[in-house]
Every structure is written in C-alpha cells, then in structure tokens.
C-alpha cells in the first residue's frame, strides 16, 4: 500500500463535476456529510450503546445457565454474535465521520466490516438450529426426550459458527484498501478486480444463503409449529405468536435493504448513476442491518414485560426468566405451556 500522509481531515466528499469551472479549485472539497451518512452515524451510536450493554447483559444472564439449560445456550450464542459485531462499530463510525477515509490499515479493513456478515450468517444459522429445535420439540418429543441435551446443542452451535466463518471468507478475501489520489483518502471496500461475474456470484450466494433460503425454510417451519400448537390447543397465547413473528421478522426486515442494494450493485456498472446513488446509501443500509445486533435484547425485555405483566422484576431476573426457561418434553404428545412459551423467545430468532 502506498503511503499516505493524511494531514488534512478537512477534505470532505468531493463530488466531481464534468463541467469546466475555473472558479472552483480542484482541491476544494465539501466538508459536510451526506444525510444518509448522518442517519447511519445516529443508528450506529444507538446500536452500539444498546447492543453492547444489552448483549453483555444477555451473555451474563445466560452464561451461568448454559450448562443445564438448552435455551440459554441458544441465547448465549446469539448474544455473542451480536456483541462481537458491535465491537466494530466505533471504527466504522470513525470512518464515516472522516468521509469514509480508512486510516486503520489493511488487516482491519478485511476483518472489521466482515464482522457484520459473520453476524448475519452466524445469526441465521443459529436461528435455523433453534428453529429445528423448536420443530423437533413439537413434532418429535420422544426423540427430544432421549437425545436433546446440552452437548448436542453446543455441537450444533459450533457447526453453525464454523459454517458462518466459511461463508464470510469471500467477503474477507476481497476486501482491500484503495488509496485515492484526490481527495486524498484511503478507502476500504471490496475489489473483484473488475470481475463482475465473481462479484455477482458472491452477491447471489449471500442473498440466497443469508436471506431467501432461510426466509423460505423458517416461514414453513414456523407455519407448521404454530398450526400444530394451535390445533393441540397447547396455548392460544397471542403473546407467543407476536414474539415469534417479531423475532423472525426483525432479521429479514433489517437485512432487506442491504441485500437488495447489494444484489443491484453487483449487476450495475460502477460508473452508472443508479450504482452511485446506491453507493451513497451503502452506509445507511449497513447501519440498518446492524440494528439486528441490538434488537434481540429489546425483544427479550418486551417479551419479559409481556409475560410478567408490569416490569416489577430487575432486568437481569426478567431476562433470566425469558431466556433460561427450559422446554419440558412430556412423553405424551401434548406440551406444557412452558414449551410453547419458550418459542416466544429470540431462540427462534429467525
């Protein structure tokens, strides 16, 4: 990487013009941030505060219970994924403040922006695992009674994390720092060496494996679960339905703009007006996706308040009540209220 003596943070975004304007010096640049960037900064700040504190609390509550409570294992892993992603936020925040200048080096460029994708894959795979767990509890209770244990849950989580890491590798490998001549700025981004086919392949895989396929499978999964639980009259609780829908919907709602813009950009020429417009919205889409990293603790608290009535208990005990309630599997095919209510938790998360 060529050296860059970045002594002038007063270089803002330079909207280059094709018109000849002798009155505008070529090295005078606008110092104001764009509206999408300002919104992204606000979202990043809120997500960081809520995400770090909320997920730290979830980790603290679930860590003690993870040895004996399977639900706690699920929530613990989801919270760790979210917490890890939140750690990159101060760096991403700083970069946007500096008009996307990246003074943190090549290694940080490869690792930090890739954390949100690791979170996406880890979350969706963990949620798929959790959903499979919910499904088995409803449809294969005897199997669950015999085989459903903490050891198997940890193995499932390890597999989910391993696959998530594997799926994040393309993003990690193609991230590079590019030092632009003017305005003097180091940018961190993906570079497919003008290989559009490769870029499209990565975007399509991300859309299918990180969004469309999980959306389809989880929708089917929860349709079956809810139909069964309603038909068995295990509970008519609309709270359960609301929380399941909230948990599942949050992932897809907050990832939708990122996925749509990502797939569109992979099919557009980098110099086209639409591409440039989408690129200006990129930070906002990333920040919107980052809301996933702080929404889980909020859902847990809202769900806890719902289950407890008014918030009379302390936050940790409320969370403990929501996150560590173990599903009881009876030999009969009916399910306890406890089993069904646990579905309400972010375990199902997507």
């Amino acid at each position: 990487m060529d050296s860059f003596n970045y002594t002038t943070p007063d270089y803002g975004h330079y909207d280059d013009k094709d018109t000849l304007d002798l009155n505008t010096p070529v090295d005078k640049t606008s110092n104001t941030l764009r509206v999408p960037d300002i919104l992204a900064l606000v979202i990043f700040a809120v997500v960081f505060l809520v995400g770090v504190l909320g997920n730290a609390l979830v980790v603290w509550v679930t860590a003690f219970e993870a040895k004996r409570t399977i639900n706690a294992i699920w929530f613990l892993n989801l919270a760790v994924a979210d917490f890890l992603s939140c750690l990159a936020l101060p760096i991403l925040f700083t970069s946007i403040v500096q008009h996307h200048h990246w003074p943190f080096g090549g290694a940080a460029c490869s690792i930090l922006p890739s954390l949100i994708l690791l979170n996406m894959y880890a979350s969706i795979l963990l949620l798929a695992t959790i959903s499979a767990d919910r499904f088995l509890l409803v449809f294969k209770p005897i199997w669950c009674q015999n085989f459903r244990g903490a050891g198997l849950a940890w193995i499932a989580c390890a597999v989910a994390w391993g696959l998530a890491l594997l799926l994040t590798i393309p993003s990690f490998l193609y991230r590079v720092v590019r030092e632009e001549y003017f305005p003097p700025k180091v940018l961190c981004g993906v570079d497919y060496s003008h290989d559009k086919r490769r870029e499209r392949a990565v975007a399509i895989v991300r859309l299918v494996l990180g969004f469309l396929w999980p959306l389809l499978t989880l929708t089917i999964c929860y349709t079956f679960i809810l139909l069964r639980t309603w038909s068995r009259r295990a509970t008519r609780s609309t709270k359960t339905l609301k929380v399941v829908v909230a948990v599942v919907a949050s992932f897809f709602i907050f990832w939708l703009p990122y996925q749509v813009t990502g797939i569109m950009m992979s099919f557009l020429e980098p110099s086209s007006p639409t591409f440039l417009l989408l690129k200006k919205l990129d930070s906002l889409c990333v920040s919107f996706a980052y809301i996933n990293c702080c929404i889980n603790p909020i859902i847990y608290v809202v769900a806890g308040q719902g289950f407890q009535g008014r918030l009379r208990k302390s936050l940790p005990s409320l969370l403990r009540n929501v996150l560590t309630e173990e599903s009881v599997v009876r030999e009969s095919k009916s399910f306890t209220r406890s089993t069904v209510d646990t579905m309400a938790q972010k375990t199902q998360a997507v």
Epitope: D16, V26, E180, Y181, F182, P270
Partner: antibody, heavy 119, light 112 residues
C-alpha cells in the same frame, strides 16, 4: 496564462541532496495542487508526489523516506527536496498542475530540469 | 501500484490513416465519485508531455476533434481518426484515480 518553470542544479554528486524550485504564474498555490514527475529512459514517467492547495502532501511510497515537498504561497514557489541521490535518480524532473479543470490529469507542465548524478 | 500496460510499443502509420492505441490497467480505475481518471498525453521530442484526453473521453482545451478516447474499468483506447504530421511523438496513458498516479510505457507513433 498558466506557466510553470523548474530551476535546479543540473549536476548532483551521489549521496548528496537535490533541490528543485518550481515557480508558477497564472494561478494561486493556495487553491491548486502541484505535482512532481520525473522521466528517465530506464523508468519512463514516474510520479513523485504532490502538494495540495491546503498544504497537505502525498508521496510515492517508493521515495517517501527521502522526499519532501513544500511551498511558499506568497512567492508562488514549490520546492522539491530529495536526499541520498543515486545514479538511477538521474532524470528530467517536471512540476505539473491540474489547474482550471476537474479531470485530475496534469494539464500544465514545466519545461523540465535535467538532473545528472555524477562525481 | 497500478500497472499501466500500453500496446503497441511502436505504431507506424501513413499520414491520413487512423491510429489506435490500447491501454490496460491492473486494477479498476473507477473512482469513488464514479469518474474514471484515465488520461492520454502526447510528448514530442525535446518537449514536456501535453494533455490530450482526460477522464477517458474528454478532450482538453485546444485538442483537435480527431482525437477520441474510450473504454471503462480496466480497458481503454485512444483513436486518432486521420493522422497528421504534428501528431507524431510518444503517447502515454496515465491514471490518477489511485496513489501513486502511474503512466504507461508509451507508444511511439511514427511515419510508416
């Protein structure tokens, strides 16, 4: 009318320093960047560095450790200083500017000053 | 650094003929602003280079319209529709999207 003119020593002994001055007219150094480019038969055209209107500098990493660019806005002069010259630093040295348009190419060049490195 | 590769090295032409010079870059030259900072220069013997085309296809002031530039991303071309005697010299492509700005090795346009 935009003009740039380099003035330098012509002959420099190995391991000594090279100092070249570029005097500009027709535009203000506070508003526009000035770059340094050299040309030798062996290396072709090679960009050395730039000093922007606000005074910040940017260098070719291959030469950064022994290169410095500064300027005097009031005198409309830009200075190139290169330390520890070797024989392969012998070249025609140009200052150039992209005044007056937005293309970031070098629209205006000085006539160049030939630098020979020899005992 | 971005490597600029020019072909051919030498281009013998007859006056009035069309000439075409190719330039390839080792990386995409699309700037974050959406512009592509690829330029063409002509250097005549004993003179400093002169800017002909900037940002791929824009003629600099005073450059005749027989000069045209095209291309995108990593592949670029300079065309001279009817070569005149004053067009002879060495043509360089150059990029100033990324640091350091780099130049091609040059293409010598000469009379056949």
């Amino acid at each position: 009318q935009v003009q740039l003119k380099e003035s330098g020593p012509g002959l420099v002994a190995p391991s000594q320093s090279l100092s070249i001055t570029c005097t500009v007219s027709g535009f203000s150094l506070t508003s526009y960047g000035v770059d340094w480019v050299r040309q030798s038969p062996g290396k072709g055209l090679e960009w050395l560095g730039v000093i922007w209107g606000v005074g910040s500098t940017n260098y070719n990493s291959a030469l950064k450790s022994r290169l410095s660019i500064s300027k005097d806005n009031s005198k409309s002069q830009v200075f190139l200083k290169m330390n520890s010259l070797q024989t392969d630093d012998a070249a025609m040295y140009y200052c150039a500017s992209h005044y007056g348009y937005d293309g970031l190419g070098f629209a205006y060049w000085g006539q160049g000053t030939l630098v020979t490195v020899s005992v | 650094d971005v490597v600029m590769t020019q072909t051919p090295l030498s281009l013998p032409v007859s006056l009035g003929d069309q000439a075409s010079i190719s330039c390839r870059s080792s990386q995409s030259l699309v700037h974050s602003s959406g512009n592509t900072y690829l330029h063409w220069y002509l250097q005549k013997p004993g003179q400093s280079p002169k800017l002909l085309i900037y940002k791929v296809s824009n003629r600099f002031s005073g450059v005749p319209d027989r000069f045209s530039g095209s291309g995108s991303g990593t592949h670029f071309t300079l065309k001279i529709s009817r070569v005149e005697a004053e067009d002879l010299g060495i043509y360089f492509c150059s990029q100033s999207t990324l640091v350091p700005p780099t130049f091609g090795g040059g293409t010598k346009l000469e009379i056949k």
